[in-house]
C-alpha cells in the first residue's frame, strides 16, 4: 500500500551491520507524487566503486546512486548527509555487505517523503500537446479555443472531419489556411458526387506547404486521396509533389489530412469538380462508331455499325448495328456485342446438281455448284461460283442470290446410231441411241421426251386415252423388261387446239396439227438411257430442205411383225410434199382427194423402203442441229402415211414451238420456274 513517508535503517542499526547481508526495500508513494529520499547517517565500509559493501538506490531500470564510506552533514543545522529525488512514485533501496569487515561499521539511516511533481515541467516528454496544468498529485491538459481534447486526455486536435461535399464544383482547404494548420489532427473530407461523374482534383504547387518527410522519406504530416480501391499520396513537402490534375475515375473521394505534434506549415488548398465519367474509346473490330469523338463521357450514346459482311448475332437472328451507352461506372453498355463475320449457312442443295461441302460458310467464302454431267448443264449460267455476301446470302456475279438451275442436256445420245440390217428398211437400235424415245402401251405408239416434265407426241396417239401409260429407258418393250424400266405417270394431256376431234377417229383424213404434250406428275431423272431431245430453233437455220436426213425410231410394225419388241430405227431423207401426195393410200377410208396436206407436215422417206409405220406414231423425226452437230432436235413427229415402206408424213414441230413453250410455261410448277 503506497505511503506518504517512511524510514529505512540498515540491519542492526545503530549497532554494527552483520557480514554477508543483502536486503532491499521497495518504496511506493501514491500516483502523481515523486519520492524524496534523505540519508541522515552513513557509515559503510569504503571500497572502490563500493564493491564490498554498499547501499544502492534504483528507479525503474536506472541506478540513481550507490553509497559507501562515512559522510557527515555540511550544514550544522541539518542532519542530512545525502539526498535523492525522483519524479516517479516507486524506488528500490538495496543494502549489501561482503563476508568480512576490517572494522566495525554502523550502516545507514534514511527516511523518504512523497513530494508533488510538476508533470508539466519535470519530464523531457511534455505530457500535453498544448496546455499543461499541474496540481498536487497530478496534472490535466487543456486546449486553445476551437480545439478539442482527444479521448487520450492529452492531445488537442481540430474538429475538421465530417464535411461531405456533394456540389459538382468546390474548394477545400486545410484548417486555418493559409495560417499554420493545427498539429496532431486528422482531418477527413468526403466528396460524394452523382453516379456517372468522376471527381477531378486540381492543385497549384504554391498552394501546398506541408511538413516535409523524414530522412527515411516518410511524411510526418500527410495529405492522402482515396477513391474506391485507388489511393493518391501520401503527399507532403513544400510545393505539391503530385500531379496537378488528379482524375479519380470515381464519384466518391475521401481526403485525409494527418498532422503530428511538430512543424506546422501553412497547409494546402485545392479545387475539385465533377467531370462526366469517361468511357474508353474501345477498339471494336469490324465496325464503325457514330458519332466519332476524341473522348466519350457518361450518357454519351454511340451507334456501332458492323462493316459489310459482319453482324451481331443473338441466337438465330442478327443485326448490323446496335447502340452502346457510356454508363455511370465508366464502362460501355453492350460491350459484349461483337461484329462477327456473317454466316451464310450451309448452301442449299439443287436438283440434279451438287455443291461441295464448303471449308467455311462465313463472309467471303466461295462455293461451287456443279450439275450432274453429262446429263445436265447449268441453264441460267453464272458458272456455279457463289460467294458469301454481306447480307448473309450466297451470291453469284451473274445470277445474284438465284440458285443455279441444272436442266437436262438435250439431243445427245450416249451412243450414236449405226445402221445394221434392214427392217422396213430399218435396223435394230439401242435405247442409248435414242434416249428420248418414249413408249406408249395403249395405243402402242411413241413419243419424245423434251424435258423433265414433258413428253411430245402426236395428237392422234392420246386423243382416245387421256391417261396413257408411258415408259422410258428400255430397248425392249417385253412385259418383263418394261417392269424394270421407268414408268411415267401423266398429270395432264394437252392436245393442240387446231387438232380436230372426230367422233369416228378411224375415218380421219385430216392430220393437220397432229401434236400433243403430256405433262408428267413427277420429273424424269436423266441418265445414259433417258435424256430429252432438243426442240427446233425459230431461226431459218431450222427450215428443212429436201434431202436433209433424219432418224426415226420406234417399236411399230415391221415387215415381219405387227409390233416390234426391240427398238428399231432408220435414217431417212426429207422429200417434197408432193411425193407423199403421189403415193396411193393403202387402205383408204375415204376418197384419196379427201386427205389433207398442209405446210405443217413434213414428207420423208422413199429411200430403200425405209419408213415409219403403225405403232411408231408420235416418235421423233430427229435431225442433226445445224448449229451444234453433237445434238439432235425433233424436226418432226411420226403422224400418218399413205403406205408403210414408202413415204411418211411428220408433224412439222418448228411451226409449234411457240405453242409448246407457252403450254409448258403456263402449266409449270414454281420449282420448274
Amino acid at each position: 500500500e503506497p505511503t506518504m513517508y517512511g524510514e529505512i535503517l540498515s540491519p542492526n542499526y545503530p549497532q554494527a551491520y552483520p557480514s554477508e547481508v543483502e536486503k532491499s526495500w521497495d518504496i511506493e508513494v501514491p500516483e502523481g507524487y515523486g519520492i524524496h529520499l534523505y540519508f541522515t547517517h552513513l557509515d559503510i565500509e569504503l571500497s572502490e566503486n563500493c564493491a564490498y559493501d554498499s547501499v544502492q538506490i534504483i528507479s525503474g531500470d536506472t541506478e540513481e546512486g550507490r553509497l559507501c564510506g562515512q559522510r557527515s552533514s555540511n550544514n550544522p543545522h541539518s542532519p542530512i548527509v545525502e539526498e535523492f529525488q525522483v519524479p516517479y512514485n516507486k524506488l528500490q533501496v538495496i543494502f549489501k555487505s561482503d563476508f568480512s569487515n576490517e572494522e566495525r561499521f554502523t550502516g545507514f539511516a534514511a527516511y523518504y517523503v512523497a513530494t508533488d511533481i510538476n508533470e508539466c515541467t519535470d519530464f523531457v516528454d511534455v505530457p500535453c500537446s498544448h496546455f499543461c496544468n499541474n496540481f498536487i498529485g497530478g496534472y490535466f491538459c487543456s486546449c486553445p479555443p476551437e480545439y478539442f481534447l482527444h479521448d487520450d486526455m492529452k492531445n488537442c486536435g481540430v474538429n475538421c472531419s465530417g464535411d461531405v461535399f456533394t456540389a459538382l464544383i468546390g474548394e477545400i482547404a486545410s484548417p486555418n489556411y493559409p495560417k499554420p494548420y493545427p498539429e496532431n489532427s486528422r482531418c477527413e473530407y468526403q466528396i460524394r458526387l452523382e453516379k456517372g461523374f468522376q471527381v477531378v482534383v486540381t492543385l497549384r504547387r504554391e498552394d501546398f506547404d506541408v511538413e516535409a518527410a523524414d530522412s527515411a522519406g516518410n511524411c510526418l504530416d500527410s495529405l492522402v486521396f482515396v477513391a474506391g480501391d485507388r489511393q493518391f499520396g501520401p503527399y507532403c513537402g513544400h510545393g505539391f509533389p503530385g500531379p496537378l490534375n488528379i482524375e479519380t475515375k470515381s464519384n466518391a473521394l475521401d481526403i485525409i489530412f494527418q498532422t503530428d505534434l511538430t512543424g506546422q506549415k501553412k497547409g494546402w488548398k485545392l479545387r475539385y469538380h465533377g467531370d462526366p465519367m469517361p468511357c474508353p474509346k474501345e477498339d471494336t473490330p469490324n465496325s464503325v462508331w457514330e458519332p466519332a469523338k476524341a473522348k466519350y463521357v457518361f450518357r454519351d450514346v454511340v451507334q456501332i455499325t458492323c462493316l459489310d459482311g459482319f453482324e451481331v448475332v443473338e441466337g438465330r437472328v442478327g443485326a448490323t448495328s446496335f447502340y452502346s451507352t457510356c454508363q455511370s461506372n465508366g464502362k460501355w453498355s453492350n460491350s459484349k456485342l461483337k461484329c462477327q463475320p456473317v454466316d451464310c449457312g450451309i448452301p442449299e442443295s439443287i436438283e440434279n446438281g451438287k455443291v461441295e461441302d464448303p471449308e467455311s460458310t462465313l463472309f467471303g467464302s466461295v462455293i461451287h455448284y456443279t450439275c450432274e454431267e453429262p446429263y445436265y448443264y447449268m441453264e441460267n449460267g453464272g458458272g456455279g461460283e457463289y460467294h458469301c455476301a454481306g447480307n448473309g446470302s450466297w451470291v453469284n456475279e451473274v445470277l445474284g442470290p438465284e440458285l443455279p438451275k441444272c436442266v437436262p442436256v438435250c439431243g445427245v445420245p450416249r451412243e450414236p446410231f449405226e445402221e445394221k440390217q434392214r427392217i422396213i428398211g430399218g435396223s435394230d437400235a439401242d435405247i442409248k441411241n435414242f434416249p428420248w424415245q418414249v413408249f406408249f402401251d395403249n395405243p402402242w405408239a411413241g413419243g419424245a421426251l423434251i424435258n423433265e416434265y414433258w413428253v411430245l407426241t402426236a395428237a392422234h396417239v392420246v386423243e382416245g386415252n387421256r391417261e396413257p401409260t408411258m415408259y422410258v429407258g428400255s430397248t425392249s418393250v417385253q412385259t418383263s423388261r418394261l417392269a424394270k424400266s421407268k414408268m411415267l405417270t401423266p398429270e395432264h394431256v394437252f392436245i393442240h387446239p387446231g387438232w380436230k376431234l372426230l367422233e369416228v377417229p378411224e375415218g380421219r383424213t385430216n392430220f393437220d396439227n397432229d401434236i400433243a404434250l403430256v405433262r408428267l406428275k413427277d420429273p424424269v431423272k436423266m441418265g445414259p438411257t433417258v435424256s430429252p431431245i432438243c426442240l427446233p430453233g425459230t431461226s431459218s437455220d431450222y427450215n428443212l430442205m429436201d434431202g436433209d436426213l433424219g432418224l426415226i425410231s420406234g417399236w411399230g410394225r415391221t415387215e415381219k411383225r405387227d409390233r416390234a419388241v426391240r427398238l428399231k430405227a432408220a435414217r431417212l431423207p426429207v422429200a417434197p410434199l408432193r411425193k407423199c401426195k403421189e403415193v396411193k393410200v393403202e387402205k383408204p377410208t375415204a376418197d384419196a382427194e379427201a386427205y389433207v396436206f398442209t405446210p405443217n407436215m413434213i414428207c420423208a422417206g422413199g429411200e430403200k423402203g425405209m419408213d415409219s409405220c403403225k405403232g411408231d406414231s408420235g416418235g421423233a423425226f430427229a435431225v442433226q442441229d445445224p448449229n451444234d452437230k453433237t445434238k439432235f432436235y425433233a424436226a418432226g413427229l411420226v403422224s400418218w402415211g399413205p403406205q408403210c415402206g414408202t413415204y411418211g408424213l411428220y408433224t412439222r414441230v418448228k411451226n409449234y414451238v411457240d405453242w409448246i413453250m407457252k403450254t409448258m410455261q403456263e402449266n409449270s410448277t414454281p420449282r420448274e420456274d
Partner: antibody, heavy 116, light 107 residues
Framework: QVQLVQSGAEVKKPGASVKVSCKAS????????MHWVRQAPEQGLEWMGW????????IYAQKFQGRVTITADTSTNTAYMELSSLRSEDTAVYYC?????????WGQGTLVTVSS | DIQMTQSPKSLSASVGDRVTITCRAS??????LDWYQQKPGQSPKLLIY???YRYSGVPSRFSGSGSGTDFTLTISSLQPEDFATYYC?????????FGQGTKLEIK
Amino acid sequence: QVQLVQSGAEVKKPGASVKVSCKASGFNIKEYYMHWVRQAPEQGLEWMGWIDPENADTIYAQKFQGRVTITADTSTNTAYMELSSLRSEDTAVYYCARSRLFFAYWGQGTLVTVSS
Amino acid sequence: DIQMTQSPKSLSASVGDRVTITCRASQDVRTALDWYQQKPGQSPKLLIYSASYRYSGVPSRFSGSGSGTDFTLTISSLQPEDFATYYCQQQYTTPYTFGQGTKLEIK
C-alpha cells in the same frame, strides 16, 4: 436448349431481405448480360438492373440503387438478385432475363410477397 | 431516364381485325426499341427487336416500324392467341425502360 430456372416463391416481412436465384442451362452466362425485371400485381414491367457475369460489372436503375445487389456465380452458371429493406410495394413477380441484343429468354418468374 | 408511353392502355378487337399499338419515347432512341407479348401467368416473349425486325418463330402478321421517338406495332389479322398485353422497351440507354403496356382484349 436455353433455359432459365428461378427459385421458388418467398414471403418476407417488411425490412427483411430476399435473394432470388436464376439457374441458366444451355448457354454460358459469361457470354451474356443477366437482367432482373419485376412486375407488381396487375402492373407493368420494371427494369431493375443487370450484371455482366464475366467481370461482375453491374448497373442498377436509380430507383433501386443501394437496395438491390445483383451477383453471379459463373461456376454454377447462376445469377442472383438480392433486394433489402423490403416494403409492401416490393410485392411482385421478379424475372431474370438474358440478353445481348434483346431479352430473348426469360425465367418463369419468382413471386415475392412482403407482408407483416 | 427515358419515359416510354404506350397508347392505347387497352383496346378491344375481333379476330381478323388489323390492330395498331403505338409507343412514344421521351427522347430519341433511334431504333433501339423492342416489343414483347405477355399472357397472364406467363413470362414476356420477344416479338420485334430493333424497331422492325421480327424475332425468329414470330408469325408474319406481327410487324414493327418507327425510329426516333415514335414506334408502332401492327398485327395485320388478329388471331385468338394474340389476345395478351404488349410492352415496348427501349434499349438505347440504361436504365432500360418499358412502356406501361397495352392490354388487347376480345370484343
